[in-house]
Interface confidence: medium
Amino acid sequence: FVRTKIDTTENLLNTEVHSSPAQRWSMQVPPEVSAEAGDAAVLPCTFTHPHRHYDGPLTAIWRAGEPYAGPQVFRCAAARGSELCQTALSLHGRFRLLGNPRRNDLSLRVERLALADDRRYFCRVEFAGDVHDRYESRHGVRLHVTAAPRIVNISVLPSPAHAFRALCTAEGEPPPALAWSGPALGNSLAAVRSPREGHGHLVTAELPALTHDGRYTCTAANSLGRSEASVYLFRFHGASGAST
């Protein structure tokens, strides 16, 4: 028999349950897991099912983004009577099963985290053979990736009326605050964080008018750290040179 499960309840652990007489599917995932970029994270997922002592073919799947339709980032399959869940897909080789599916544990380990990994993940288990059944977490677990600031670009650009402006773009989570310092700017912070503009963890700050030659420094800071980068403005006969 084949059934599509529909989640009916959820508690603080995101325990998703399907109940009917003499059988019960449920999946437990935490609402959120936090980890720092570069580190590893564990995405816990356990389940219960109505098929007592099931030892038939089994597939464990993790998706990203959205349930049921999101792209798979990990998939492994175990043959009947086998505990070896052979990995068929591990995106960029960074995903591996931490749990034992035969013990109803689909927990996943994600290595070398990047800010791009900050999204929601959904676990799924499929039974085949004598029993055909499947279940997927609908709410999933949100992986929150934090990172110290990193300045990804700093530049000087021409602007109207033979003037120059400076741009500084940084990434980090929490999104970093950006500040400029330089000639005639004193010790004051000359710019604040700009809107994120839908670019995920990227933040850009502009210094609209560079009025003096010299070194201009962009500082990016959040709760995890700070980063600095500089550009130099020298005007020769109306031309400019800028270097980082």
């Epitope: 437990q28 816990p44 009577g81 869940c85 099963l97 931490l98 109803n104």
Partner: antibody, heavy 117, light 107 residues
């Protein structure tokens, strides 16, 4: 650093009860399944019980089923083993161990339980 | 339930290769884990998922699984490797099973 510290062991009479605790630190306790493993004096390792990260799944060795209960309090980063109807053959060093499909990758130093009259 | 059988003892000269076997029914369809335990200490995981090594474990430790026998191999055995070694796996009934242990003596 990652650490597990067991406590609660001691001398108990046959038929008595004891509750072991395991305090976890240095890692996100709520992300991991946990186990109890014991070792009788001069003997090998024997798995006792397993609990999933959310307490939704628990498993026991046949030798302790119905007598021992594993539990955890994720808010306190603590694992427990309630041992009832203790027998002389339960005498052992009891270890808590972090693990799941990757085996037991972190162990405590153990606590000795002696069942004797 | 599966039973894992290990030789009670294995001896090896320093610098030589030590092999410790672990046999059990249908072991080829299971993950095998190996632990090292020195006197008075807690066990330490040295091999997981049959042939993977945790960080911090020397490269001389390796694992393999063929047929119904898993093997822990220690190449270039050192005096500090003298210890008890245990294999472990899962049973389909959700029981964890350990082998009886092997005492490795470095001569």
């Amino acid at each position: 650093q990652v650490q597990l510290v067991e406590s609660g062991g001691g001398l108990v009479q046959p038929g008595g009860s004891l509750r072991l605790s395991c305090a976890a630190s240095g890692f996100t306790f709520t992300n991991y399944a946990m186990n109890w493993v014991r070792q009788a004096p001069g003997k090998g390792l024997e798995w006792v019980s397993y609990i999933s990260y959310s307490s939704s799944n628990t498993y026991y060795a046949d030798s302790v089923k119905g007598r021992f209960t594993i539990s955890r309090d994720n808010s306190k980063n603590t694992l427990y083993l309630q041992m009832n109807s203790l027998r002389a053959e339960d005498t052992a060093v009891y270890y808590c161990a972090r693990g799941a499909g990757l085996g037991y990758d972190v162990w405590g130093q153990g606590t000795l339980v002696t069942v004797s009259s | 339930d599966i039973e894992l059988t290990q030789p009670p003892s294995v001896s090896v000269a320093p610098g030589q290769t030590a092999r410790i076997s672990c046999s059990g029914d249908n072991l080829r369809s299971k993950y095998v884990y190996w632990y090292q335990q020195k006197p008075g200490q807690a066990p330490v995981l040295v091999i997981y998922d049959t042939n993977d090594r945790p960080s911090g474990i020397p490269e001389r430790f390796s694992g393999s699984n063929s047929g119904n026998t898993a093997t822990l191999t220690i190449s270039g055995t050192q005096a500090e490797d003298e210890a008890d070694y245990y294999c472990q796996t899962y049973d389909m009934t959700s029981q964890d099973v350990f082998g009886g242990g092997t005492k490795l003596t470095v001569l």
